[in-house]
Amino acid sequence: RRDVAHGILNEAYRKVLDQLSAGKHLQSLVARGVGGSLGGGAGDDAEPLSKRHSDGIFTDSYSRYRKQMAVKKYLAAVLGKRYKQRVKNKGRR
């Protein structure tokens, strides 16, 4: 189940990052406090998701890697809320 969830998240993550035009959007995410509680740095542009590395992506910049993890974390939170909402709504029917 966790693998399926990871798969869905990674797919959504890839689409979002590919669509981001994205310095602005990323910076707004980071400004809203998406970065890690002990890690993080302020925004830079996203790049198309091409090469994969582990669960995340390949990037040569460590700050960009952190930014991408922050976006992924944000998406996980958003998707998680949506999923919980759907389950709630189903329960009401």
Partner: antibody
Framework: EVQLVQSGAEVKKPGSSVKVSCKAS????????MHWVRQAPGQGLEWMGL????????RYAQKFQGRVTITADESTSTAYMELSSLRSEDTAVYYC??????????WGQGTLVTVSS | DIVMTQSPDSLAVSLGERATINCKSS???????????LNWLQQKPGQPPKRLIY???TRESGVPDRFSGSGSGTDFTLTISSLQAEDVAVYYC?????????FGGGTKVEIK
């Protein structure tokens, strides 16, 4: 205050593996970038890799690719670094370190791994 | 990988005198986010390293103000304005801008 406590010293045979642990306290463990750095006796520092526990996402130094595995157990706030196919040159003190502001702000006390036949 | 070259390898300075350590990177450490991820660590015998300076010039809280970092791009300097006995240690620069993260070879600071 974040604290990192590492497992004790190990003596290993060439060709074997070692697994070093690093237990974190005083912070949100899953939401940190946990790095591993080693230091051979009388030598400088060498970055081995990192893990972001929330997604179990890892990044390894090219030099150690295929030989190092970094994992994390969120339930115990513990990170692990396993190094396989050990050789004498792997004799070193292994440190875990937590990133803050893109720099290693917190360090474990170090774990000496001795590789000897 | 980015090569970090530190100089000198060792340095003997009289108490109260200035100590200067240089660090040169093989590529600019200015990141796309506008920050320069050049860091300085202090390591005393038998101890783990300790962060002194990050972002090239930001002093870690609790670090005495005799320690200062400067530089940009590829050339950086750590200065100890007035050397104290407790400053005897090995100092390392390292870069956190590019993977793989890399360290300088270290500079041993001793009292003359």
């Amino acid at each position: 205050e974040v604290q990192l406590v590492q497992s004790g010293a190990e003596v290993k045979k060439p060709g074997s593996s070692v697994k070093v642990s690093c237990k974190a306290s005083g912070g949100t463990f899953s939401d940190v970038y946990m790095h591993w750095v080693r230091q051979a006796p009388g030598q400088g520092l060498e970055w081995m890799g990192l893990i972001y526990p929330i997604f179990a996402d890892t990044r390894y130094a090219q030099k150690f690719q295929g030989r190092v595995t970094i994992t994390a157990d969120e339930s115990t706030s513990t990170a692990y670094m396993e190094l396989s196919s050990l050789r004498s040159e792997d004799t070193a003190v292994y440190y875990c370190a937590i990133d803050q502001d893109g720099s290693f702000a917190y360090w474990g006390q170090g774990t000496l791994v001795t590789v000897s036949s | 990988d980015i090569v970090m070259t530190q100089s000198p390898d060792s340095l003997a300075v009289s108490l109260g005198e200035r100590a200067t350590i240089n660090c040169k990177s093989s590529q600019s450490l200015l990141d796309a986010d506008g920050k320069t991820y050049l860091n300085w660590l202090q390591q005393k015998p038998g101890q783990p390293p300790k962060r002194l300076i990050y972002w090239a010039s930001t002093r870690e809280s609790g670090v005495p103000d005799r320690f200062s970092g400067s530089g940009s791009g590829t050339d950086f300097t750590l200065t100890i304005s007035s050397l104290q006995a407790e400053d005897v240690a090995v100092y390392y620069c390292w870069q956190g801008t590019w993977f793989d993260l890399t360290f300088g070879g270290g500079t041993k600071v001793e009292i003359k």
